[in-house]
């Protein structure tokens, strides 16, 4: 019995269906086929869980969190014992193993390993201003998403004709900050932060209005 090489790793967007491949060759009939799918979750590497089991011509549920979401892609028994996981969750990220036994065929490699990473688009970020908006001050524009796998990068833009930040601005696309030094009335305007990762983007808006000093009456 020989389980075919797996692609190594699979990436899927949260909520979509993942197909975990596992095929094998055997010299024996599939009368005594026994297939166990296991996962070692990334979030809890010390706690392997059963995903689904095929034994004695019957299918059995694995861990409760997979109930109703997991099944074999084809009619069993078969030499293609790939499984699907519907409505993938972040907690489904981990290393999956298919363990195949088909007596009396013994020997050879009977385990296939596939990594699954569930990707999450950035949630809409939170935009805020840190610092005084008085003319001549320094301000920091802050942008961060609560969710996003891989970790989002952040791009600030000023929504004028150029989409360019003021010349006194410095941007950190990893932290999501823009520091604008010595703000002037020209700094005023609507700013948009775009949070991006491999599978999506999201945005937030911030209206920065620089406050000019009021003329003082000299009596």
């Amino acid at each position: 019995l020989e389980v075919s090489e797996s692609p190594g790793s699979i990436q899927v967007a949260r909520g979509q269906t993942a197909v975990l491949p596992c095929t094998f060759t055997t010299s024996a009939a599939l009368i005594n086929l026994n297939v166990i799918w296991m996962v070692t979750p990334l979030s809890n590497a010390n706690q392997p869980e059963q995903v689904i089991l095929y034994q004695g011509g019957q299918m059995f549920d694995g861990a409760p969190r997979f109930h109703g979401r997991v099944g074999f892609t084809g009619t069993m028994p078969a030499t293609n014992v790939s499984v699907f996981i519907n409505n993938t969750q972040l907690s489904d990220t981990g290393t999956y193993q298919c363990l195949v036994n088909n007596l009396p065929d013994i020997g050879g490699r009977n385990i296939g390993v596939t990594g699954l990473t569930v990707l999450v688009p950035p949630s809409a970020p939170h935009c805020q201003i840190q610092g005084s908006q008085d003319i001549g001050s320094d301000v920091i524009l802050l942008c961060s998403s609560e969710e996003g796998i891989p970790r989002p990068t952040y791009l600030w833009e000023k929504l004028d004709n150029t989409l360019k930040l003021p010349p006194t601005a410095t941007q950190d696309q990893v932290q999501g900050t823009v520091t604008i030094r010595n703000i002037s009335t020209l700094t005023s305007g609507l700013y948009q932060c775009v949070a991006s990762n491999a599978i999506g983007t999201s945005t937030c808006l911030l209206d920065l209005q620089v406050i000019s000093p009021q003329p003082r009456n000299i009596g």
Epitope: T185, L190, Q192, T201, S202
Partner: antibody, heavy 121, light 107 residues
Framework: EVQLLESGGGLVQPGGSLRLSCAAS????????MSWVRQAPGKGLEWVSA????????YYADSVKGRFTISRDNSKNTLYLQMNSLRAEDTAAYYC??????????????WSQGTLVTVSS | DIQMTQSPSSLSASVGDRVTITCRAS??????LNWYQQKPGKAPKLLIY???SLQSGVPSRFSGSGSGTDFTLTISSLQPEDFATYYC?????????FGQGTKVEIK
């Protein structure tokens, strides 16, 4: 009480121009960004343009960019929309709307009653 | 641009009914969502801002919920004055965009 009163709507030929005005009262006009939103007959709402409280920053929907100009006169508490090169698809009721300030930019909390602009030959 | 999709486009209901309107954004918009009511020949009126906050003066039978991409406007017990068209609107990104509207009619 916040009030927004429009004027300037009417019938205009394709390629023509029109200027809408919106007189504001009941709040400190210069403290609020203002916007224009339109609604074609029997259709939904479409944001057209916005302007900051000071008037220094203006924003437009792609559909009107280069043809429409938003402006304001804070001494007169009045918002304007200059519409040039008008097209049949600009036919709509035009509303001026006050926008919440700061981090709530983009929320229209008070609206005018609307003025109808008809572009037809 | 962020697309906003409302469902249903119209519904018929009776006074006293509980009515639910949904709005879906084409990308996550967090809670940057507003709901408006518009009666025929009238200007829109802000009902709910920030997805779930009731605008001052709006009856408590109106409520909003949701975050991310899926949002709901609920009228707990429909009153005669509630027959109107309802619009959702996102303020997460530019340009500001509205849903196509949901018309609530008398059954």
């Amino acid at each position: 009480e916040v009030q927004l009163l429009e004027s300037g709507g009417g019938l205009v030929q394709p390629g023509g121009s029109l200027r809408l005005s919106c007189a504001a009262s009941g709040f400190t006009f210069s403290s609020y960004a203002m916007s224009w939103v339109r609604q074609a007959p029997g259709k939904g709402l479409e944001w057209v343009s916005a302007i900051s409280g000071s008037g220094g920053s203006t924003y437009y929907a792609d559909s009107v960019k280069g043809r429409f100009t938003i402006s304001r006169d804070n001494s007169k508490n009045t918002l304007y929309l200059q519409m040039n090169s008008l097209r049949a698809e600009d036919t709509a009721a035009y509303y001026c709307a006050r926008m919440a300030a700061g981090a709530s930019w983009g929320t229209f909390d008070y609206w005018s009653q609307g003025t109808l602009v008809t572009v037809s030959s | 641009d962020i697309q906003m999709t409302q469902s249903p486009s119209s519904l018929s209901a009776s006074v006293g009914d509980r009515v639910t309107i949904t709005c879906r954004a084409s990308q996550s918009i967090s809670s940057y969502l507003n709901w408006y009511q518009q009666k025929p020949g009238k200007a829109p009126k802000l009902l709910i801002y920030a997805a779930s906050s009731l605008q001052s003066g709006v009856p408590s039978r109106f409520s909003g919920s949701g975050s991310g991409t899926d949002f709901t406007l609920t009228i707990s017990s429909l009153q005669p004055e509630d027959f109107a068209t309802y619009y959702c609107q996102q303020r997460s990104g530019s340009p500001l965009t509205f849903g196509q509207g949901t018309k609530v009619e008398i059954k």
